[in-house]
C-alpha cells in the first residue's frame, strides 16, 4: 500500500521528506517565508495529507502563494509611493509614506518606509504596523515675510499667504437684545484649533462676570485676505470655546482662549499654523521685533478695545500688518502706573510699541498673534496675543500695546488641545 511519490509545491517543502510513503504516513506541506499554503482558495500556514489504505493521498498537494499585504492604508494628509515596479504589494515589496509638503511633516522624522512582511502586514522598523503621523508644519509661510530691519510706520497691506495662521473671528451673540456683533483675530495652531484672547470670546455682558459666548455664535474665517471677498476663505463654526479659567476682566490677566473648530481645516499656502513658543516665563526679549496683523488696524484714532467693541464696521478691507519692538517690562509697567485707573501690567503680559508714539502702537485686532521669527528653528512663533492698550488715542506718546505672554500658557494650551507635548515636539520652537 505504497502512495505515489510527492512533489513539493513551488516555494514550499514537504516534511518528512522520504523516498517512499506507506499507509498511515502523514506529510506536512509548508511554504517558504513570505508564502502561504493555498488550498481550495483558503490560505493557511501548513496543510497535512495522509497516505490512505488504498495507496492514494487523502488530498492533492496544495500550492504556495506569495503573501500579499494588499493596498496600504490611507494616510491622512499623506501620500504613498510604491518602490517596486507595477505597484506590487506582495512579500518584500516596499512602499513609502510621505506627508503633503510643505504643509505637513512626518512626526519624529520617520523614514515612512514600510515593507510587506511575511505575515502579510506592512511593517516599519520603528512604528511596526502603525501608520506614521503627518503633523501640520508651523510658522513657515509659503511667502517670505519681510525683512525686519527697516521699521514700518503704521500698517501695510499684507500679501495673501504672508500670515497664513491669521484667523478672523466673528461673534454674533443672538441671545442679546439687540443682537451683539463684534470681531477679533486669532491664530491657527493646528488644523482644528485657534488661539485668541479670552476677552474676544467673553460674552459682552452688562456685568463683569466671565461667561464665554455660545459656540453657536462664533464663526472663524481662515485664509482670508480681503474681507469684501470671503469666497476664497475657509469658514468654520466652533465645536468648543475655551476661556482660560483665571481670566480676570478687571485687569485682563490670563487673557487667552482657544476655539476648537467643528471640522479640521485643509492646510495650504494660505492656511498654515503658527508655532507655539517654549514654556518660558521671561517671554520675548526686550527690543526684539515682532509682527502683528489684523483687519482692524486701518483706523488710527481708535484704540484696540474700541475697535473690538464697535463691531465689524471698523474692519479694514485688506489684512494689514505692522512691525513693533518688545518693550522692557519695567518701562511698560512704569508708563501704565503713571496713569489713573487700574492699569497693572502683570507677569503674564508684555508690551510692544514705540516710546515716541505713532499709530503703530495700537494697531491690530484683539486676539491677533504677535509673531517673532526664531532664528534657530527658522520658524515664526506666536509670542503674544493683542490684549489691551491705554485709554488715550492710538499713537499717543509712551502708550504701549499690551500682549498676553503666550509662553506662560504653553502647557495649558497643549492640555486643552488634548495632545501630550512629546507628540507635538516638532511644533515647539527649538
Amino acid at each position: 500500500n505504497e502512495c505515489p511519490e510527492l512533489q513539493p509545491p513551488v516555494h514550499g517543502k514537504i516534511e518528512p521528506s522520504q523516498a517512499k510513503y506507506f499507509f498511515k504516513d502523514q506529510v506536512l506541506v509548508s511554504c517558504d517565508t513570505g508564502y502561504k499554503v493555498l488550498k481550495d482558495n483558503v490560505e493557511m500556514d501548513t496543510f497535512q495529507i495522509e497516505c490512505l489504505k488504498d495507496g492514494t493521498w487523502s488530498n492533492k498537494i496544495p500550492t504556495c502563494k506569495i503573501v500579499d499585504c494588499r493596498a496600504p492604508g490611507e494616510l491622512e494628509h499623506g501620500l504613498i509611493t510604491f518602490s517596486t515596479r507595477n505597484n506590487l504589494t506582495t512579500y518584500k515589496s516596499e512602499i513609502k509614506y510621505s506627508c503633503q509638503e510643505p504643509y505637513y511633516k512626518m512626526l519624529n522624522n520617520n523614514t515612512g518606509i514600510y515593507t510587506c512582511s511575511a505575515q502579510g502586514v506592512w511593517m516599519n522598523k520603528v512604528l511596526g504596523r502603525s501608520l506614521p503621523t503627518c503633523l501640520p508644519e508651523c510658522g513657515q509661510p509659503s511667502r517670505s515675510l519681510p525683512s525686519l530691519v527697516k521699521r514700518i510706520i503704521g500698517g501695510r497691506n499684507a500679501e495673501p499667504g504672508l500670515f497664513p495662521w491669521q484667523a478672523l473671528i466673528v461673534v454674533e451673540d443672538t441671545s442679546r437684545v439687540p443682537n451683539d456683533k463684534w470681531f477679533g483675530s486669532g491664530a491657527l495652531l493646528s488644523a482644528s484649533w485657534i488661539l485668541t484672547a479670552a476677552h474676544v470670546l467673553r460674552s459682552q455682558r452688562r456685568d463683569t462676570t466671565v461667561i464665554p459666548v455660545s459656540k453657536e455664535h462664533v464663526t472663524v474665517y481662515l485664509g482670508l485676505h480681503d474681507v469684501r471677498d470671503k469666497s476664497g476663505a475657509v469658514n468654520s463654526s466652533a465645536a468648543r470655546v475655551v476661556l482660560h479659567p483665571d481670566f480676570n476682566i478687571q485687569n485682563y490677566n490670563h487673557d487667552i482662549a482657544l476655539v476648537q473648530l467643528q471640522e479640521p481645516v485643509p492646510l495650504g499656502p494660505h492656511v498654515m499654523p503658527v508655532c507655539l513658543p517654549r514654556l518660558e516665563p521671561e517671554g520675548p526679549a526686550p527690543h526684539m521685533l515682532g509682527l502683528v496683523a489684523g483687519w482692524g488696524i486701518s483706523n488710527p484714532n481708535v484704540t484696540v478695545d474700541e475697535i473690538i467693541s464697535s463691531g465689524t464696521r471698523t474692519l479694514s478691507d485688506v489684512l494689514q500688518y505692522v512691525k513693533l519692538p518688545v518693550v522692557p517690562h519695567a518701562e511698560c509697567k512704569t508708563s501704565y502706573e503713571s496713569r489713573s485707573g487700574n492699569y497693572s501690567v502683570t507677569e503674564n503680559m508684555f508690551c510692544a510699541g514705540y516710546y515716541e508714539g505713532g499709530k503703530d502702537t495700537c494697531l491690530g485686532d484683539s486676539g491677533g498673534a504677535f509673531v517673532i521669527f526664531d532664528d534657530l528653528s527658522q520658524r515664526w512663533v506666536v509670542q503674544g496675543l493683542v490684549s489691551w492698550g491705554g485709554p488715550e488715542e492710538c499713537g499717543s506718546k509712551q502708550v504701549y500695546g499690551v500682549y498676553t505672554k503666550v509662553s506662560n500658557y504653553v502647557d495649558w494650551v497643549w492640555e486643552q488641545m488634548g495632545l501630550p507635548q512629546s507628540v507635538v515636539e516638532p511644533q515647539v520652537e527649538r
Epitope: 441671545s175 437684545v177 476677552h199 455682558r205 452688562r206 456685568d207 463683569t208 462676570t209 461667561i211 455660545s214 476682566i249 478687571q250 485687569n251 485682563y252 478695545d305 474700541e306 467693541s309 485707573g341 487700574n342 492699569y343 489691551w388 485709554p391
Partner: antibody
C-alpha cells in the same frame, strides 16, 4: 417668548427652610445666568445670588452665603433658591431674573411667621 | 463691598418737566479694560418686578423710551427723565455690577 414662572406663595415658621422654583422657557437655559433678588414689604431691592446653569457656578451676597443655596435642574429648565433658618425679616417677595435682568419672574411671596 | 447711595429719596415733578436722580458709588465702577461703567438703572411700579432701563451707565435697553437717559462715569451717575409722563411714576433703583451686585436704596418719583 421668554418666560420665567415662579412657584406660589409660601408661609413658613421661623427656623424652617423654603425652596422657591423658577421655570424658564423661550431661550436656551444653559446660555445665561439666573439672578435672585428679594424685596421686603415697602423696602428696596436686595441681591441674593447668581447661578450659571452651564457649569453650576454660583456667586452669593455675603449676607446670604451661609443660608441661601442656588441650584438648577437643566433637564426641566428650572432654577431653585433655598433659604434656610428663616426668620421674620426674611418675609419678602423673591424674584428670579434672567438674560441679565431683561426678564423677571412674577415674584414669590414668602411669609415667615410663628 | 460697594455701597450705592441714591439721592433724593423721593422726588415730585410736574408732568412734562425734567426729573433727575443721582447715584453715587463707594468706588469707581469704570473698568479700564472694557472701558465700561458697570451701572444700571431700574424702574419698579407697585406689584411688579423691576424693569431694566439703562445699562453700562448710558446704554438704553431695547424698547425703553428715549426720554430716559443715563450719564456719568467712575463714581457719580445720573438718570434723567427729560419730560415726565404719568406712567413714569415709580421707584427707580441704580445697581452696580462691577463687583457682584448692589442696589441703591431707591428714589420714589411722583407727580407734583
Amino acid at each position: 417668548q421668554v418666560q420665567l414662572v415662579q412657584s406660589g406663595a409660601e408661609v413658613k415658621k421661623p427656623g424652617a427652610s423654603v425652596k422657591v422654583s423658577c421655570k424658564a422657557s423661550g431661550y436656551t437655559f444653559t446660555t445665561d445666568d439666573i439672578n435672585w433678588v428679594r424685596q421686603a414689604p415697602g423696602q428696596g431691592l436686595e441681591w441674593i445670588g447668581w447661578i450659571y446653569p452651564r457649569d453650576d457656578r454660583t456667586k452669593y451676597n455675603d449676607k446670604f452665603k451661609d443660608r441661601a443655596t442656588l441650584t438648577v435642574d437643566t433637564s426641566s429648565n428650572t432654577a431653585y433658591m433655598e433659604l434656610s433658618s428663616l426668620r421674620s425679616e426674611d418675609t419678602a417677595v423673591y424674584y428670579c431674573s434672567s438674560l441679565e435682568d431683561t426678564y423677571w419672574g412674577q415674584g414669590t411671596l414668602v411669609t415667615v411667621s410663628s | 463691598d460697594i455701597v450705592m447711595t441714591q439721592s433724593p429719596d423721593s422726588l415730585a415733578v410736574s408732568l412734562g418737566e425734567r426729573a433727575t436722580i443721582n447715584c453715587k458709588s463707594s468706588q469707581s465702577l469704570l473698568n479700564s479694560r472694557t472701558r465700561k461703567n458697570y451701572l444700571a438703572w431700574y424702574q419698579q411700579k407697585p406689584g411688579q418686578p423691576p424693569k431694566l432701563l439703562i445699562y453700562w451707565a448710558s446704554t438704553r435697553e431695547s424698547g425703553v423710551p428715549d426720554r430716559f437717559s443715563g450719564s456719568g462715569s467712575g463714581t457719580d451717575f445720573t438718570l434723567t427723565i427729560s419730560s415726565l409722563q404719568a406712567e413714569d411714576v415709580a421707584v427707580y433703583y441704580c445697581k452696580q455690577s462691577y463687583n457682584l451686585y448692589t442696589f441703591g436704596q431707591g428714589t420714589k418719583v411722583e407727580i407734583k
